[in-house]
Protein backbone atom coordinates (compact mmCIF):
# COMPACT_ATOMS: atom_id res chain seq x y z
CA UNK A 1 0.00 0.00 0.00
CA UNK A 2 1.06 3.59 -0.60
CA UNK A 3 3.10 5.39 2.00
CA UNK A 4 3.32 9.16 1.99
CA UNK A 5 4.79 11.71 4.31
CA UNK A 6 3.28 11.58 7.79
CA UNK A 7 1.29 14.21 9.57
CA UNK A 8 1.53 13.63 13.30
CA UNK A 9 -0.89 15.08 15.82
CA UNK A 10 -1.17 14.25 19.49
CA UNK A 11 -3.59 15.67 21.99
CA UNK A 12 -4.00 15.44 25.75
CA UNK A 13 -5.76 12.10 25.44
CA UNK A 14 -2.53 10.69 24.02
CA UNK A 15 -4.29 9.96 20.75
CA UNK A 16 -1.44 9.08 18.47
CA UNK A 17 -2.47 9.72 14.91
CA UNK A 18 -0.37 9.13 11.83
CA UNK A 19 -2.35 9.88 8.74
CA UNK A 20 -2.06 10.36 5.03
CA UNK A 21 -4.66 10.73 2.33
CA UNK A 22 -4.90 6.99 1.66
CA UNK A 23 -4.70 5.51 5.15
CA UNK A 24 -4.89 6.15 8.84
CA UNK A 25 -3.32 4.40 11.79
CA UNK A 26 -4.07 5.82 15.21
CA UNK A 27 -3.93 4.63 18.78
CA UNK A 28 -5.82 6.08 21.71
CA UNK A 29 -4.38 5.63 25.19
CA UNK A 30 -4.79 7.85 28.27
CA UNK A 31 -1.62 9.45 29.60
CA UNK A 32 -2.02 7.85 33.03
CA UNK A 33 -4.07 5.31 34.98
CA UNK A 34 -3.94 5.24 38.79
CA UNK A 35 -4.79 2.34 41.08
CA UNK A 36 -3.88 1.05 44.53
CA UNK A 37 -1.53 -1.83 45.20
CA UNK A 38 -3.47 -5.06 45.58
CA UNK A 39 -6.29 -3.83 43.38
CA UNK A 40 -6.77 -4.26 39.62
CA UNK A 41 -6.31 -1.63 36.92
CA UNK A 42 -7.47 -1.33 33.33
CA UNK A 43 -5.10 0.05 30.71
CA UNK A 44 -7.29 1.32 27.87
CA UNK A 45 -6.03 1.14 24.28
CA UNK A 46 -8.06 1.41 21.10
CA UNK A 47 -6.84 1.84 17.54
CA UNK A 48 -7.91 2.51 13.99
CA UNK A 49 -6.17 1.13 10.92
CA UNK A 50 -6.24 1.57 7.15
CA UNK A 51 -6.97 -2.08 6.26
CA UNK A 52 -10.69 -2.24 5.68
CA UNK A 53 -12.39 -5.39 7.01
CA UNK A 54 -9.11 -7.03 7.96
CA UNK A 55 -9.83 -10.53 9.29
CA UNK A 56 -6.42 -12.15 8.89
CA UNK A 57 -4.13 -13.36 11.67
CA UNK A 58 -3.30 -10.75 14.27
CA UNK A 59 -1.19 -10.47 17.38
CA UNK A 60 -1.87 -8.09 20.27
CA UNK A 61 1.08 -7.18 22.48
CA UNK A 62 1.63 -5.10 25.58
CA UNK A 63 5.16 -4.27 26.64
CA UNK A 64 6.59 -2.38 29.59
CA UNK A 65 9.28 0.24 30.02
CA UNK A 66 9.93 1.48 26.50
CA UNK A 67 8.29 1.21 23.09
CA UNK A 68 9.52 -1.35 20.54
CA UNK A 69 12.21 -2.79 22.81
CA UNK A 70 10.73 -3.19 26.29
CA UNK A 71 9.92 -6.67 27.62
CA UNK A 72 6.55 -8.11 26.67
CA UNK A 73 4.13 -8.58 29.56
CA UNK A 74 1.18 -9.79 27.51
CA UNK A 75 0.68 -11.31 24.09
CA UNK A 76 -2.24 -13.01 22.40
CA UNK A 77 -2.86 -14.23 18.88
CA UNK A 78 -6.06 -14.51 16.88
CA UNK A 79 -6.29 -16.83 13.89
CA UNK A 80 -7.80 -15.75 10.58
CA UNK A 81 -11.48 -14.93 11.04
CA UNK A 82 -11.41 -15.67 14.78
CA UNK A 83 -12.70 -13.26 17.41
CA UNK A 84 -10.79 -15.15 20.10
CA UNK A 85 -7.35 -13.79 20.91
CA UNK A 86 -5.65 -16.71 22.54
CA UNK A 87 -3.26 -15.70 25.33
CA UNK A 88 0.30 -16.80 24.66
CA UNK A 89 1.96 -14.72 27.38
CA UNK A 90 0.66 -13.22 30.60
CA UNK A 91 3.47 -12.28 32.96
CA UNK A 92 2.86 -13.95 36.35
CA UNK A 93 -0.68 -14.69 35.08
CA UNK A 94 -1.82 -11.20 36.09
CA UNK A 95 -2.54 -9.68 32.67
CA UNK A 96 -5.79 -10.29 30.80
CA UNK A 97 -7.15 -8.80 27.60
CA UNK A 98 -10.46 -7.02 28.18
CA UNK A 99 -10.88 -5.65 24.68
CA UNK A 100 -11.49 -7.43 21.40
CA UNK A 101 -8.65 -6.74 18.93
CA UNK A 102 -11.01 -7.56 16.03
CA UNK A 103 -13.02 -4.57 17.20
CA UNK A 104 -9.92 -2.41 17.50
CA UNK A 105 -9.71 -2.67 21.27
CA UNK A 106 -6.54 -3.85 23.04
CA UNK A 107 -7.52 -2.78 26.56
CA UNK A 108 -5.74 -4.77 29.26
CA UNK A 109 -6.61 -5.63 32.86
CA UNK A 110 -3.80 -5.99 35.38
CA UNK A 111 -4.64 -7.95 38.53
CA UNK A 112 -3.09 -7.82 42.02
CA UNK A 113 -1.09 -4.67 41.46
CA UNK A 114 2.28 -4.24 43.11
CA UNK A 115 4.49 -1.17 43.35
CA UNK A 116 6.84 -2.82 40.84
CA UNK A 117 4.06 -2.51 38.23
CA UNK A 118 4.39 1.27 38.36
CA UNK A 119 5.79 1.94 34.89
CA UNK A 120 4.82 2.87 31.35
CA UNK A 121 3.02 0.35 29.15
CA UNK A 122 2.77 0.25 25.35
CA UNK A 123 0.12 -1.51 23.28
CA UNK A 124 0.91 -2.94 19.87
CA UNK A 125 -0.99 -4.73 17.15
CA UNK A 126 0.49 -6.79 14.32
CA UNK A 127 -1.33 -7.93 11.21
CA UNK A 128 0.14 -10.95 9.45
CA UNK A 129 -0.66 -12.90 6.31
CA UNK A 130 -1.83 -11.10 3.17
CA UNK A 131 -1.77 -7.73 4.86
CA UNK A 132 1.52 -7.26 6.60
CA UNK A 133 1.49 -4.33 9.00
CA UNK A 134 2.10 -3.29 12.58
CA UNK A 135 1.66 -0.32 14.87
CA UNK A 136 2.70 0.48 18.43
CA UNK A 137 1.79 3.25 20.81
CA UNK A 138 4.88 5.42 21.08
CA UNK A 139 3.95 7.27 24.27
CA UNK A 140 2.11 4.55 26.10
CA UNK A 141 0.09 4.77 29.28
CA UNK A 142 1.70 5.35 32.67
CA UNK A 143 0.37 3.02 35.34
CA UNK A 144 0.64 4.87 38.63
CA UNK A 145 0.41 2.46 41.54
CA UNK A 146 -0.25 3.93 44.98
CA UNK A 147 0.29 2.08 48.25
CA UNK A 148 0.01 2.64 51.97
CA UNK A 149 3.37 2.47 53.77
CA UNK A 150 4.91 -0.86 54.64
CA UNK A 151 8.08 -1.21 56.67
CA UNK A 152 10.19 -3.74 54.84
CA UNK A 153 13.20 -3.77 57.17
CA UNK A 154 14.14 -2.49 60.61
CA UNK A 155 17.47 -3.36 62.19
CA UNK A 156 20.20 -2.38 64.62
CA UNK A 157 23.75 -2.47 63.30
CA UNK A 158 27.13 -1.99 64.98
CA UNK A 159 28.89 1.32 64.48
CA UNK A 160 32.54 2.24 65.11
CA UNK A 161 33.68 2.60 68.70
CA UNK A 162 31.20 0.06 70.14
CA UNK A 163 28.21 2.23 69.23
CA UNK A 164 25.04 1.16 67.47
CA UNK A 165 22.83 2.63 64.76
CA UNK A 166 19.32 1.80 63.64
CA UNK A 167 18.03 1.57 60.08
CA UNK A 168 14.42 1.61 58.95
CA UNK A 169 13.37 1.03 55.32
CA UNK A 170 9.80 1.46 54.16
CA UNK A 171 7.99 1.41 50.84
CA UNK A 172 4.91 3.24 49.69
CA UNK A 173 3.56 5.61 47.09
CA UNK A 174 3.61 8.50 47.67
CA UNK A 175 6.98 7.75 49.32
CA UNK A 176 6.32 7.75 53.07
CA UNK A 177 7.76 10.12 55.62
CA UNK A 178 9.73 8.23 58.28
CA UNK A 179 10.09 9.16 61.93
CA UNK A 180 11.93 7.49 64.80
CA UNK A 181 10.83 7.58 68.41
CA UNK A 182 12.57 6.06 71.39
CA UNK A 183 14.45 6.68 74.66
CA UNK A 184 15.56 10.31 74.91
CA UNK A 185 14.57 10.85 71.28
CA UNK A 186 11.06 12.19 71.20
CA UNK A 187 10.11 12.13 67.52
CA UNK A 188 12.93 12.46 65.07
CA UNK A 189 13.15 12.33 61.30
CA UNK A 190 16.72 11.15 61.77
CA UNK A 191 18.72 11.26 58.52
CA UNK A 192 16.13 10.22 55.96
CA UNK A 193 17.72 9.00 52.78
CA UNK A 194 15.90 9.90 49.62
CA UNK A 195 14.58 7.05 47.49
CA UNK A 196 17.37 5.10 45.85
CA UNK A 197 17.61 4.93 42.07
CA UNK A 198 15.91 1.83 40.80
CA UNK A 199 14.06 1.58 44.13
CA UNK A 200 11.85 4.64 43.70
CA UNK A 201 9.32 3.60 46.34
CA UNK A 202 11.82 2.76 49.09
CA UNK A 203 12.79 5.27 51.73
CA UNK A 204 15.37 4.68 54.47
CA UNK A 205 15.84 6.56 57.75
CA UNK A 206 18.89 6.10 59.97
CA UNK A 207 19.41 6.76 63.66
CA UNK A 208 23.17 7.22 63.69
CA UNK A 209 23.81 6.70 67.41
CA UNK A 210 21.65 4.83 69.88
CA UNK A 211 22.58 6.26 73.26
CA UNK A 212 20.04 4.49 75.47
CA UNK A 213 18.73 0.97 75.86
CA UNK A 214 15.06 0.42 75.11
CA UNK A 215 12.50 0.28 72.39
CA UNK A 216 12.99 2.28 69.20
CA UNK A 217 9.97 2.67 66.90
CA UNK A 218 9.98 3.64 63.25
CA UNK A 219 6.78 5.13 61.87
CA UNK A 220 6.11 5.44 58.13
CA UNK A 221 3.22 7.60 56.94
CA UNK A 222 1.77 8.85 53.69
CA UNK A 223 -1.65 10.06 52.51
CA UNK A 224 -2.92 6.47 52.35
CA UNK A 225 -1.99 5.33 55.84
CA UNK A 226 0.73 4.60 58.35
CA UNK A 227 2.76 1.68 59.58
CA UNK A 228 5.14 1.18 62.46
CA UNK A 229 7.68 -1.35 63.64
CA UNK A 230 9.97 -1.51 66.65
CA UNK A 231 13.40 -2.78 67.53
CA UNK A 232 14.80 -3.28 71.05
CA UNK A 233 18.35 -2.51 72.15
CA UNK A 234 19.75 -4.10 75.31
CA UNK A 235 23.46 -3.74 75.85
CA UNK A 236 25.38 -6.00 78.19
CA UNK A 237 27.19 -3.35 80.17
CA UNK A 238 30.83 -4.04 80.66
CA UNK A 239 30.88 -6.14 77.51
CA UNK A 240 31.11 -5.12 73.91
CA UNK A 241 28.09 -7.09 72.74
CA UNK A 242 24.46 -6.14 72.48
CA UNK A 243 21.16 -7.96 72.24
CA UNK A 244 18.48 -6.72 69.87
Amino acid sequence: FVRTKIDTTENLLNTEVHSSPAQRWSMQVPPEVSAEAGDAAVLPCTFTHPHRHYDGPLTAIWRAGEPYAGPQVFRCAAARGSELCQTALSLHGRFRLLGNPRRNDLSLRVERLALADDRRYFCRVEFAGDVHDRYESRHGVRLHVTAAPRIVNISVLPSPAHAFRALCTAEGEPPPALAWSGPALGNSLAAVRSPREGHGHLVTAELPALTHDGRYTCTAANSLGRSEASVYLFRFHGASGAST
Epitope: R3, H18, T59, Y68, P71, Q72, A79, A88, R138
Partner: antibody, heavy 118, light 112 residues
Protein backbone atom coordinates in the same frame (compact mmCIF):
# COMPACT_ATOMS: atom_id res chain seq x y z
CA UNK B 1 24.77 -12.39 26.64
CA UNK B 2 22.63 -13.06 23.58
CA UNK B 3 23.75 -16.07 21.56
CA UNK B 4 22.40 -17.94 18.55
CA UNK B 5 24.20 -21.10 17.49
CA UNK B 6 23.36 -23.11 14.36
CA UNK B 7 23.79 -26.86 14.08
CA UNK B 8 26.23 -28.26 11.54
CA UNK B 9 25.14 -28.14 7.91
CA UNK B 10 26.63 -30.61 5.51
CA UNK B 11 26.88 -32.03 2.04
CA UNK B 12 23.64 -33.26 0.49
CA UNK B 13 22.58 -34.48 -2.92
CA UNK B 14 19.97 -32.63 -5.01
CA UNK B 15 16.43 -33.69 -4.18
CA UNK B 16 17.37 -34.82 -0.68
CA UNK B 17 16.49 -33.23 2.67
CA UNK B 18 18.35 -31.60 5.55
CA UNK B 19 17.15 -30.07 8.81
CA UNK B 20 19.00 -27.18 10.44
CA UNK B 21 18.52 -26.16 14.05
CA UNK B 22 19.50 -23.08 15.99
CA UNK B 23 19.82 -22.83 19.78
CA UNK B 24 19.14 -19.38 21.24
CA UNK B 25 20.03 -18.06 24.68
CA UNK B 26 20.38 -14.80 26.58
CA UNK B 27 16.97 -13.39 25.66
CA UNK B 28 13.30 -14.29 25.96
CA UNK B 29 13.07 -16.44 22.85
CA UNK B 30 9.27 -16.35 22.55
CA UNK B 31 9.23 -12.53 22.59
CA UNK B 32 10.79 -12.39 19.12
CA UNK B 33 10.23 -13.42 15.56
CA UNK B 34 13.14 -15.50 14.29
CA UNK B 35 14.49 -15.82 10.76
CA UNK B 36 16.91 -17.64 8.50
CA UNK B 37 19.13 -15.66 6.14
CA UNK B 38 21.51 -17.31 3.67
CA UNK B 39 24.57 -16.31 1.69
CA UNK B 40 25.69 -18.20 -1.38
CA UNK B 41 29.49 -18.39 -1.81
CA UNK B 42 30.87 -14.95 -2.75
CA UNK B 43 27.31 -13.56 -2.97
CA UNK B 44 25.20 -11.21 -0.87
CA UNK B 45 22.67 -11.79 1.89
CA UNK B 46 19.31 -13.33 1.05
CA UNK B 47 16.42 -13.62 3.50
CA UNK B 48 14.93 -17.12 3.45
CA UNK B 49 12.13 -17.43 6.03
CA UNK B 50 10.71 -15.93 9.22
CA UNK B 51 8.42 -17.19 11.97
CA UNK B 52 6.23 -15.39 14.48
CA UNK B 53 6.49 -15.53 18.26
CA UNK B 54 4.37 -18.63 18.69
CA UNK B 55 4.96 -20.18 15.30
CA UNK B 56 1.47 -19.36 14.08
CA UNK B 57 2.61 -17.20 11.18
CA UNK B 58 5.43 -18.06 8.79
CA UNK B 59 6.91 -16.22 5.83
CA UNK B 60 9.06 -17.58 2.97
CA UNK B 61 10.82 -16.22 -0.05
CA UNK B 62 9.19 -17.46 -3.25
CA UNK B 63 12.08 -19.70 -4.31
CA UNK B 64 11.83 -21.89 -1.17
CA UNK B 65 8.04 -21.83 -0.68
CA UNK B 66 6.69 -25.37 -0.49
CA UNK B 67 10.18 -26.88 -0.06
CA UNK B 68 11.39 -25.30 3.18
CA UNK B 69 9.56 -25.26 6.52
CA UNK B 70 10.52 -22.95 9.37
CA UNK B 71 9.40 -23.95 12.87
CA UNK B 72 10.28 -23.30 16.48
CA UNK B 73 10.15 -24.89 19.92
CA UNK B 74 9.79 -22.13 22.50
CA UNK B 75 10.18 -24.57 25.39
CA UNK B 76 13.61 -25.53 24.06
CA UNK B 77 14.54 -22.05 22.72
CA UNK B 78 15.22 -23.65 19.35
CA UNK B 79 14.57 -22.60 15.76
CA UNK B 80 14.45 -25.09 12.88
CA UNK B 81 14.64 -25.06 9.10
CA UNK B 82 13.50 -28.23 7.36
CA UNK B 83 14.85 -28.16 3.80
CA UNK B 84 13.33 -30.64 1.34
CA UNK B 85 13.83 -31.14 -2.42
CA UNK B 86 17.16 -29.34 -2.18
CA UNK B 87 18.64 -27.75 -5.31
CA UNK B 88 22.17 -26.72 -6.18
CA UNK B 89 21.12 -23.07 -5.91
CA UNK B 90 20.34 -23.66 -2.22
CA UNK B 91 24.08 -24.04 -1.58
CA UNK B 92 24.91 -21.32 0.93
CA UNK B 93 25.92 -20.47 4.45
CA UNK B 94 22.70 -20.36 6.48
CA UNK B 95 22.45 -17.89 9.35
CA UNK B 96 19.95 -18.01 12.18
CA UNK B 97 19.01 -14.50 13.29
CA UNK B 98 16.70 -12.74 15.70
CA UNK B 99 14.13 -10.78 13.72
CA UNK B 100 13.07 -7.64 15.55
CA UNK B 101 10.62 -5.59 13.49
CA UNK B 102 11.89 -2.25 14.70
CA UNK B 103 15.37 -3.42 15.70
CA UNK B 104 16.45 -5.33 12.61
CA UNK B 105 18.37 -8.59 12.49
CA UNK B 106 20.22 -7.70 15.66
CA UNK B 107 21.89 -11.02 16.50
CA UNK B 108 23.34 -13.57 14.11
CA UNK B 109 24.68 -17.07 14.50
CA UNK B 110 28.09 -18.10 13.20
CA UNK B 111 26.50 -19.61 10.09
CA UNK B 112 26.47 -23.17 8.82
CA UNK B 113 27.44 -24.24 5.30
CA UNK B 114 24.99 -26.34 3.30
CA UNK B 115 26.37 -27.75 0.05
CA UNK B 116 23.95 -29.27 -2.45
CA UNK B 117 25.78 -31.20 -5.14
CA UNK B 118 25.77 -34.55 -6.85
CA UNK C 1 9.28 -7.29 -3.61
CA UNK C 2 11.11 -4.14 -2.63
CA UNK C 3 14.44 -3.81 -4.43
CA UNK C 4 17.36 -2.30 -2.50
CA UNK C 5 20.05 -0.80 -4.74
CA UNK C 6 23.46 0.07 -3.29
CA UNK C 7 26.22 2.30 -4.64
CA UNK C 8 29.10 2.22 -5.12
CA UNK C 9 29.97 -1.46 -5.56
CA UNK C 10 33.28 -0.88 -3.79
CA UNK C 11 35.18 2.03 -2.30
CA UNK C 12 38.71 2.56 -0.98
CA UNK C 13 39.19 4.99 1.88
CA UNK C 14 42.29 6.37 3.57
CA UNK C 15 42.38 5.79 7.34
CA UNK C 16 40.99 8.83 9.15
CA UNK C 17 38.98 9.95 6.12
CA UNK C 18 35.22 9.73 5.87
CA UNK C 19 33.21 7.41 3.65
CA UNK C 20 29.60 7.37 2.49
CA UNK C 21 27.57 4.48 1.14
CA UNK C 22 24.23 4.96 -0.57
CA UNK C 23 21.16 2.75 -0.72
CA UNK C 24 17.94 3.32 -2.64
CA UNK C 25 14.68 1.42 -2.22
CA UNK C 26 12.18 0.83 -5.01
CA UNK C 27 9.39 1.86 -2.66
CA UNK C 28 9.05 4.16 0.33
CA UNK C 29 10.21 2.52 3.56
CA UNK C 30 8.48 5.15 5.68
CA UNK C 31 5.66 3.49 7.59
CA UNK C 32 2.61 5.48 8.57
CA UNK C 33 3.77 5.22 12.19
CA UNK C 34 6.73 7.42 11.31
CA UNK C 35 9.26 4.59 11.44
CA UNK C 36 11.54 4.07 8.46
CA UNK C 37 12.22 0.34 8.20
CA UNK C 38 15.74 0.48 6.80
CA UNK C 39 18.76 -1.12 8.47
CA UNK C 40 22.51 -1.26 7.86
CA UNK C 41 24.75 -4.28 8.42
CA UNK C 42 28.48 -4.88 8.22
CA UNK C 43 30.01 -8.21 7.35
CA UNK C 44 33.69 -8.28 8.21
CA UNK C 45 35.89 -10.75 6.29
CA UNK C 46 35.16 -14.33 7.39
CA UNK C 47 32.56 -13.21 9.96
CA UNK C 48 28.78 -13.16 10.37
CA UNK C 49 26.94 -9.92 9.58
CA UNK C 50 26.42 -7.46 12.42
CA UNK C 51 23.78 -4.78 12.85
CA UNK C 52 25.09 -1.20 12.64
CA UNK C 53 22.02 1.02 12.24
CA UNK C 54 18.35 0.34 12.89
CA UNK C 55 15.30 2.37 11.85
CA UNK C 56 17.43 4.40 9.43
CA UNK C 57 19.33 6.49 11.96
CA UNK C 58 19.65 4.68 15.30
CA UNK C 59 23.05 3.34 16.31
CA UNK C 60 23.00 -0.31 17.38
CA UNK C 61 24.41 -1.29 20.75
CA UNK C 62 28.22 -1.42 20.84
CA UNK C 63 28.67 0.31 17.47
CA UNK C 64 31.15 3.23 17.49
CA UNK C 65 29.59 6.66 17.04
CA UNK C 66 31.68 7.32 13.95
CA UNK C 67 28.91 5.44 12.14
CA UNK C 68 25.71 7.31 11.33
CA UNK C 69 22.65 6.72 9.21
CA UNK C 70 20.37 9.21 7.50
CA UNK C 71 17.96 9.44 4.62
CA UNK C 72 14.45 10.07 3.38
CA UNK C 73 11.69 7.69 2.32
CA UNK C 74 13.63 5.94 -0.46
CA UNK C 75 17.21 7.26 -0.30
CA UNK C 76 19.49 6.30 2.54
CA UNK C 77 23.10 6.97 3.47
CA UNK C 78 25.53 5.31 5.84
CA UNK C 79 28.44 7.54 6.82
CA UNK C 80 31.69 6.58 8.52
CA UNK C 81 33.27 9.77 9.80
CA UNK C 82 36.81 8.52 10.48
CA UNK C 83 37.77 5.32 8.66
CA UNK C 84 39.62 2.74 10.74
CA UNK C 85 41.25 -0.52 9.65
CA UNK C 86 38.61 -2.55 11.52
CA UNK C 87 35.85 -1.01 9.40
CA UNK C 88 36.77 -2.98 6.27
CA UNK C 89 34.15 -5.39 5.01
CA UNK C 90 30.95 -5.49 3.03
CA UNK C 91 28.14 -3.14 4.02
CA UNK C 92 24.53 -4.09 3.34
CA UNK C 93 21.32 -2.13 3.65
CA UNK C 94 18.10 -4.04 4.24
CA UNK C 95 14.39 -3.47 4.71
CA UNK C 96 11.88 -5.01 7.11
CA UNK C 97 8.81 -3.18 5.92
CA UNK C 98 7.34 -5.83 3.66
CA UNK C 99 7.66 -9.51 2.91
CA UNK C 100 9.88 -10.60 1.21
CA UNK C 101 12.48 -8.85 3.36
CA UNK C 102 15.35 -7.79 1.15
CA UNK C 103 18.97 -6.66 1.25
CA UNK C 104 21.06 -4.55 -1.06
CA UNK C 105 23.80 -6.28 -3.05
CA UNK C 106 26.50 -4.88 -0.75
CA UNK C 107 29.27 -2.29 -0.89
CA UNK C 108 32.83 -3.43 -0.29
CA UNK C 109 34.82 -0.99 1.81
CA UNK C 110 38.61 -1.26 1.67
CA UNK C 111 41.55 0.60 3.15
CA UNK C 112 43.57 2.69 0.73
Amino acid sequence: EVQVVESDGGFVQPGRSLKLSCAASGFTFSDYYMAWVRQAPTKGLEWVAAISYDGITTYYRDSVMGRFTISRDNAQNTLYLQMDSLRSEDTATYYCTRHDWEGGFAYWGQGTLVTVSS
Amino acid sequence: GIVMTQAPLSVSVTPGESASISCRSSKSLLHSSGITYVFWYLQKPGKSPQLLIYRMSNLASGVPDRFSGSGSETDFTLKISRMEAEDVGIYYCGQLLENPFTFGSGTKLEIK
